[in-house]
Interface confidence: low
């Protein structure tokens, strides 16, 4: 099929970075500035993406590949190929229609993006809360209350390391 196609289509041998120019008897012409073709046999070149405003250029456009954008500091990418930039928030916050808002009690966000998520419910796994959650951090679940009952063996955590020459307070 490919051989048949190439016999029928004089444009099929135009390589990536060029286009088959119908205005010049279908010879291969290089893509004009600020355009590209990533595959051979193209009848037109695509316009390069321009990383403007909140977008910044991560990879320049070439004759064979489109530019790639990311977001300026204070923003992060959303969507395929970074089609949108969304404002960062602080840890412990989420972005709403009214801007960055603190996570509600019982929820946390440990990133500058995304939504606040509920703390882990330790009791669902039969465990107890070892470290309370905050707006920025999830709770830390510890051993189950049964594991801590008298007579049950428990692993003693290692003593914190101290610098030599310092006695315990």
């Amino acid at each position: 099929f490919e051989r048949t196609r190439s016999l029928q289509d004089p444009c099929s041998n135009c390589p990536a970075g060029t286009f088959c120019d119908n205005n010049r008897n279908q010879i291969c012409s290089p893509c004009p500035p600020n355009s590209f073709s990533s595959a051979g046999g193209q009848r037109t070149c695509d316009i390069c993406r321009q990383c403007k405003g909140v977008f910044r250029t991560r990879k320049e456009c070439s004759s064979t590949s489109n530019a790639e954008c990311d977001c300026t500091p204070g923003f992060h990418c959303l969507g395929a190929g970074c089609s949108m930039c969304e404002q960062d928030c602080k840890q412990g916050q989420e972005l709403t229609k009214k801007g960055c808002k603190d996570c509600c009690f019982g929820t946390f966000n440990d990133q500058k993006r995304g939504i606040c998520r509920p703390w882990t419910n330790c009791s669902l796994d039969g465990k107890s809360v070892l470290v309370n959650g905050t707006k920025e951090r999830d709770v830390v679940c510890g051993p189950s209350p049964a594991d801590l009952s008298p007579g049950a063996s428990s692993v003693t955590p290692p003593a914190p390391a101290r610098e030599p020459g310092h006695s315990p307070q």
Partner: nanobody, 121 residues
């Protein structure tokens, strides 16, 4: 009704400074992103700077380090402080209300009428 009223334009010598203001009304100012654009004679309108509801800012490469965008939510006003002005900064400067805080190449929902800045010796 959304209204954007620019002021502060004028004639200034190269190296000089100007402060443009854009007084906004008719919408909830503090939760919206605002931008400044400019159009030089015979050229297309181009992005200059934007400021988002959280006060994050973005600048065109050509004005970085010389222009500063700021906002006063209490006064519903956005400002463009321009310094080290050059002849190529001569243009009509437009205030724009951007579409939300999620931005795809800042798209403008509403424009002001513009204020002329002329930089010449």
């Amino acid at each position: 009704e959304v209204q954007l009223l620019e002021s502060g334009g004028g004639e200034v010598q190269p190296g000089g400074s100007l402060r443009l203001s854009c007084a906004a009304s008719g919408f909830s100012f503090s939760i919206n992103a605002m931008g400044w654009y400019r159009q030089a004679p015979g050229k297309r309108r181009e992005f200059v700077a934007a400021i988002y509801s959280g006060s994050s800012t973005v600048y065109a490469e050509s004005v970085k380090g010389r222009f500063t965008i700021s906002r006063d939510n209490a006064k519903n006003t956005v400002y463009l402080q321009m310094s080290s002005l050059r002849a190529e900064d001569t243009a009509v400067y437009y205030c724009g209300l951007l579409k939300g805080n999620r931005v795809v190449s800042p798209s403008v929902a509403y424009w002001g009428q513009g204020t002329l800045v002329t930089v010449k010796p």
